[in-house]
């Protein structure tokens, strides 16, 4: 209840997260008449990326474009990108939708289609659907430890969500263990009323809200966090312009002294940790 006699001040907070878990991934890549099944293990360094602010990212799905090299090649024949003669291709033109700079030539992409030749990382990325089910769907069982230090400078009071008495092998549960700061990703989604398996395909943004309602008076002292969860991105992926959450990154390597790269379009969940609350003292 609101204690009008108290002097209130907003919480100042810092957050640190640590994700743990291993995923076994079976990739199924078909090209040139060969379906290549690849089995790989993903650990924390493979699926998490450092983010600024109170956020962390877990990759749940990806599309790879392997063996790209900087050269000339036909651009991907997306809608409106096909040509029939060089007149359609403008030397030096950089179409925002394209992956390179046009050379001015119209060249065969395959047996039936021609597109403008571009100077780019080749072969250019194909517009592929995100794999379904998600390749790292087992990320549902990953856990994240959230360390949250808070401070009320006006009241000269500092505390943290992790208490010395806490068990390092606990898992957060709204009823049985509401003060445990280790969260199973699947449980976060369940609490928010979302389906992890579904969101994992295209990615999304999930909010972890930490609410501190602190009574700092010595006679009725209470200052513990309350956790709640809600999805922050537009879940109606059919209606939203760019569904889900994804970004691209590349792994560079040399083969026969030629610089090459594997382009990875990573889909996943960005978790935003939102800390708010007040501290009140007489």
């Amino acid at each position: 209840s609101d204690k009008l006699y108290q002097r209130k001040e907003p919480v100042i907070s810092s957050v640190h997260t640590k994700v743990k878990g291993i995923a076994e991934v079976t990739e199924n890549v078909t090209e040139g008449g060969v379906t290549k099944l690849g089995h790989s293990i993903f650990d924390t360094a493979d699926y998490t990326f450092p983010l600024q602010g109170n956020s962390f990212f877990v990759m749940t799905n990806y599309v790879k474009s392997e063996g790209q090299v900087q050269t000339l090649c036909p651009e991907y024949p997306r809608r409106g990108a096909q040509c029939s003669s060089d007149r359609r291709c403008k030397k030096g033109w950089m179409d925002p939708q394209s992956k390179g700079i046009q050379t001015g030539r119209c060249v065969p992409y395959d047996k039936t289609r021609k597109t403008c030749e571009v100077s780019a990382w080749c072969p250019t990325e194909e517009e592929k659907e995100a794999p379904r089910p998600a390749l790292l769907r087992s990320a549902e069982n990953f856990t994240v430890l959230i360390k949250n230090n808070i401070h009320f400078p006006g009241h000269n009071y500092t505390t943290r969500n992790i208490l010395p008495t806490m068990n390092g092998s606990c898992t957060f549960h709204k009823t049985w263990d509401p003060q445990c700061s280790i969260f199973r990703l699947g449980d976060i989604f369940q609490e928010a009323g979302e389906n992890f398996t579904e969101v994992a395909v295209q990615g999304g943004i999930m909010g972890i809200e930490i609410y501190w309602d602190c009574n700092l008076d010595s006679w009725s002292h209470h200052c513990r966090p309350r956790y709640s969860f809600r999805r922050l991105d537009d879940k109606n992926t059919d209606e939203s312009f760019v569904p889900g959450y994804n970004f691209r990154y590349a792994k560079y390597y040399k083969e026969n002294n030629v610089e090459k790269r594997t382009l990875i379009k990573a889909f996943g969940i960005r978790f935003d940790i939102l800390v708010f609350g007040t501290g009140g003292k007489f």
Epitope: E31, G32, G33, V34, T35, K36, L37, G38, H39, K111
Partner: nanobody
Framework: EVQLVESGGGLVQTGGSLRLSCAAS????????IAWFRQAPGKEREGVSI???????FYADSVKDRFSITADGAKTTVFLQMNSLKPEDTAIYYC??????????????????????WGQGTQVTVSS
């Protein structure tokens, strides 16, 4: 009509080399991947090597670093260069056009995409 004709088999001593050829007609190598399979007496057929229609190569673990698959410039003939041959390489070698699965060093036919087109085979015997 799709046709595959193998040649180049024969008798060779352990450590020796052979070069098998597969002449393809009725289609181009842009349409299908080409693989070499082999069958030893009393054993199951096993995939040895694949040349995908975009030029990527795949090898079974048992022949990696010893065998090499290539095609000629006109993409009408596929070769299997076999070096450091061992008695366990003795088998009938078949050239196959179709769709294949490569799974951690094992090669098989992608039967979901049909049974492929097979040549009549060429015998390779490695004596010790």
């Amino acid at each position: 009509e799709v046709q595959l004709v193998e040649s180049g088999g024969g008798l060779v001593q352990t450590g020796g080399s052979l070069r098998l050829s597969c002449a393809a007609s009725g289609f181009t190598l842009d349409d299908y991947a080409i693989a070499w399979f082999r069958q030893a007496p009393g054993k199951e057929r096993e995939g040895v090597s694949i040349l995908s229609s975009i030029g990527k190569t795949f090898y079974a673990d048992s022949v990696k670093d010893r065998f090499s698959i290539t095609a000629d410039g006109a993409k009408t003939t596929v070769f299997l260069q076999m070096n450091s041959l061992k008695p366990e390489d003795t088998a009938i070698y078949y050239c196959v056009a179709g769709h294949f699965v490569y799974n951690d060093g094992a090669i098989s036919l992608n039967t979901a995409r049909g049974s492929g087109f097979w040549g009549q085979g060429t015998q390779v015997t490695v004596s010790s």
